[in-house]
């Protein structure tokens, strides 16, 4: 097992993830592991010397960087909130705040916007990827209603008048609940279906 530093005539190293080619000395040297940086470069007689990243800084990968990356907070102006804090090995993890979706992606989400309202008679389709896309409004299924403009309101089942000992006065629609009345209440004239012969 050859350990760094070792000579390399073809400018390639055995383990590209954990080693790098140093052209000045024509040798392969160790990279520094995640959470560390190069505090002293390698030479023919000594391998790379690594040091731990200072507080509020990180390096995610095996590297030969002479500095660590500065931790950045999740930007609330962009609608982002923290999932997990920055450590020496990873940057701050962010997501969209509740009621928002990711409107702009780089490698990660960079900008969140408010979810669109779903109009009466519809509801937001439930997604696996909550917050990663805007609402897609779908009609309430039969026997259900939703009577507000809202990004999160769910369609509710129509009231069953008979369950309450009442009778239906007006049927429910996608935008309104069933109207019930007492069986003893007389129907208004326009709703009376009785014809005298």
């Amino acid at each position: 097992q050859v350990v760094p530093p070792y000579g390399s005539e073809n400018q390639t190293c055995r383990d590209q993830e954990k080693e790098y080619y140093e052209p000045r000395h024509r040798i392969c040297c160790s990279r520094c592991p995640p959470g560390t940086y190069v505090s002293a470069k390698c030479s023919r007689s000594r391998d790379t010397v690594c040091a731990t990243c200072a507080e509020n800084s990180y390096n995610e990968h095996w590297n030969y960087l002479t500095i660590c990356q500065l931790c950045r907070p999740c930007d609330p102006v962009m609608g982002l909130e923290e999932i997990a804090p920055c450590t020496s090995k990873r940057k701050t993890q962010c997501r969209c705040q509740p009621g928002m979706f990711c409107a702009a992606w780089a490698l990660e989400c960079t900008h969140c916007e408010l979810l669109s309202d779903c109009p009466p008679g519809t509801e937001a389709e439930l997604k696996d990827e909550v917050g990663k896309g805007n609402n897609h409004c779908v009609p309430c299924k039969a026997g259900h209603f939703q009577n507000t403009s809202s990004p999160s309101a769910r369609c509710q089942p129509h009231t069953r008048c008979e369950d309450q000992g009442l009778v239906e006065a007006a049927p429910g629609t996608a935008q309104s609940d069933t109207t019930c009345r007492n069986p003893s209440e007389s129907l208004p004239p326009e709703m009376s279906g009785t014809m005298l012969m």
């Epitope: 990873r90 701050t92 993890q93 997501r95 990711c102 992606w105 990660e108 989400c109 990827e129 990663k132």
Partner: nanobody
């Protein structure tokens, strides 16, 4: 535990094409943001492209825009990187990575990598 296995690397001439595949197993990947990274000899690891599992939120590094395309096939739990008009500077080990939170701020699962060499 999640496993990512890359394939499709190899030797190609400048101007040629390759398609890399990343097969994911061990869990449902519905919520995962997937990405391709690469590490060229003597360089730091860099992100090349990323995609959400609904196909949205795609990202490309400036150096590959218009030449590389990331896509996914949910039925096969596989992510692809179509690489066209390859250049010698695209020579690198290409790694597939998954972010289990889906937000792309920390890729916690990695494949072993597949070597792409662009040379005449």
């Amino acid at each position: 535990e999640v496993q990512l296995v890359e394939s499709g690397g190899g030797l190609v001439q400048p101007g040629g094409s390759l398609r890399l595949s990343c097969a994911a197993s061990g869990r449902t990947f519905t919520n995962y943001r997937m990405a391709w990274f690469r590490q060229a000899p003597g360089k730091e690891r860099e992100a090349v492209a990323a995609i959400n599992w609904n196909g949205g939120g795609t990202y490309y590094a400036d150096s590959v825009k218009g030449r590389f395309t990331i896509s996914r096939d949910n039925a096969k739990n596989t992510v692809y990187l179509q690489m066209n008009s390859l250049r010698p500077e695209d020579t690198a080990v290409y790694y597939c990575a998954a972010d289990s939170t889906g937000w792309g701020s920390y890729f916690d699962y990695w494949g072993q990598g597949t070597l792409v060499t662009v040379s005449s």
